[in-house]
Amino acid sequence: GELETSDVVTVVLGQDAKLPCFYRGDSGEQVGQVAWARVDAGEGAQELALLHSKYGLHVSPAYEGRVEQPPPPRNPLDGSVLLRNAVQADEGEYECRVSTFPAGSFQARLRLRVLVPPLPSLNPGPALEEGQGLTLAASCTAEGSPAPSVTWDTEVKGTTSSRSFKHSRSAAVTSEFHLVPSRSMNGQPLTCVVSHPGLLQDQRITHILHVSFLAEASVRGLEDQNLWHIGREGAMLKCLSEGQPPPSYNWTRLDGPLPSGVRVDGDTLGFPPLTTEHSGIYVCHVSNEFSSRDSQVTVDVLDPQEDSGKQVDLVSAS
């Protein structure tokens, strides 16, 4: 006859492990008892349980309440046991010793492997600002047994570096993702992916990138100077910029206070019907926590009468 078992039994921490031991006998052989023991190298054998064909299961005190036989129907040649609620300390070598009649004793060993699934954590790096060099965007750490795999899933261009720390029964892996911050990265997901044999599927933690920046400011509204004439209604200047965090806008006049009747509405400066006193140099001041920008324009309000006179002069001059 021969014993049929597994070389390795793998179980996730906290789950139950079936330790297989099946005697495939020759004609008429019977199993009298099956003894299970833990037999780690360098240590004496520690008895788990004894399965007796007549007297049933006896569990040693150290494993009381943790070792059971499979539920019936049970093949009398099946000496398998169930080890409940596996802990890391259960990892190691086990031996089943089968006493048969009339063939004698047989023994087989298996290794119990207890997987400890990781609980990953993601830590964002320092605030990202456009113009910085290579900067830590995030680090991801996962500890388990065996060592987990930590990778990154993102469309963002960057570099990764990993390091591992071995503990007595587990290993911690930390992976860092570095990048050169640019505004195009804003709002992009950076996902830490942790793989481990104890996980049914990869664990994913996503961090949304925030890159502080402030674009150059410019002012729109003066594209056609001829529109800026006395009496025109609805004239406005709009300050263009963008940033993260979103910027705030402030309007001033370089050569004096803002004329009465001029309305400031965020990025827009609204004018009442234009008069010559609206001529001047206007400054849009854009700022956020990251930076500030200025853009200035000169408004020259035309007097149509003056203009037409000039045109006549020009014509007469020709």
Epitope: Q15, F22, D26, S27, Q30, P70, P72, N75, L77
Partner: antibody, heavy 116, light 106 residues
Framework: QVQLKQSGPGLVQPSQSLSITCTVS????????VHWVRQSPGKGLEWLGV???????DYNAAFISRLSISKDTSKSQVFFKMNSLQADDTAIYYC??????????WGQGTSVTVSS | DIQMTQSPASLSVSVGETVTITCRAS??????LAWYQQKQGNSPQLLVF???NLADGVPSRFSGSGSGTQYSLKINSLQSEDFGTYYC????????FGGGTKLEIK
């Protein structure tokens, strides 16, 4: 070559008994157990019981009061007997050789109709 | 008794395709699971035992996987002879079978 051949009646009167013999070849009943399973359109496949290589038996709790399985190792035969059959026992009855936690060879099946 | 829920109940596929049939146990069965194929008018035939082990003579396009309560049978590159009904069965306590998956040619 492993074979299991079944013999038994096709028609059984209600409340009567069903007896099927499973004759095996290519292996010894002292080394392998034999399971009994039935299949019906209404209930699908149902495990009924097993006789192990050492001669001990286990039965499905739903049939324990009216089922017995025995064997004659020297003749390589396993005997299946079920009492008090009713119409819902109409099914195909199979014997099958035990592999560790599986059935690796099946008989051809015995189609049983329970009807008066 | 432990219940075995098999899905899908039927599927229609073409030769050369890959299919996966799943079986969910109502509690942990510790990989004590077998898969069988049955063709019309024939007895079931063992394909996989102990969740992952191919029975003798079974082509390598068949593979079993799973643990705990979730198990699956995968058939790569289906051949015409693979069509039939597939059953899972557990052996942890009173054995019970899944309801079957009928695999038909599209």
């Amino acid at each position: 070559q492993v074979q299991l051949k079944q013999s038994g009646p096709g028609l059984v009167q209600p409340s009567q008994s069903l007896s099927i013999t499973c004759t095996v070849s290519g292996f010894s009943l002292t080394n392998y157990g034999v399971h009994w399973v039935r299949q019906s359109p209404g209930k699908g496949l149902e495990w009924l019981g097993v006789i192990w290589s050492g001669g001990s038996t286990d039965y499905n709790a739903a049939f324990i009061s009216r089922l017995s399985i025995s064997k004659d190792t020297s003749k390589s035969q396993v005997f299946f007997k079920m009492n008090s059959l009713q119409a819902d026992d109409t099914a195909i009855y199979y014997c099958a050789r035990e592999l560790i936690h599986a059935m690796d060879n099946w008989g051809q099946g015995t189609s049983v109709t329970v009807s008066s | 008794d432990i219940q075995m829920t098999q899905s899908p109940a039927s599927l229609s596929v073409s030769v050369g395709e890959t299919v996966t049939i799943t079986c969910r146990a109502s509690e942990n069965i510790y990989s004590n699971l077998a898969w069988y194929q049955q063709k019309q008018g024939n007895s079931p035939q063992l394909l996989v035992f102990a969740a992952t082990n191919l029975a003798d003579g079974v082509p390598s396009r068949f593979s079993g996987s799973g643990s705990g309560t979730q198990y699956s049978l995968k058939i790569n590159s289906l051949q015409s002879e693979d069509f039939g009904t597939y059953y899972c069965q557990h052996f942890w306590g009173t054995p019970t079978f899944g309801g079957g998956t009928k695999l038909e040619i599209k």
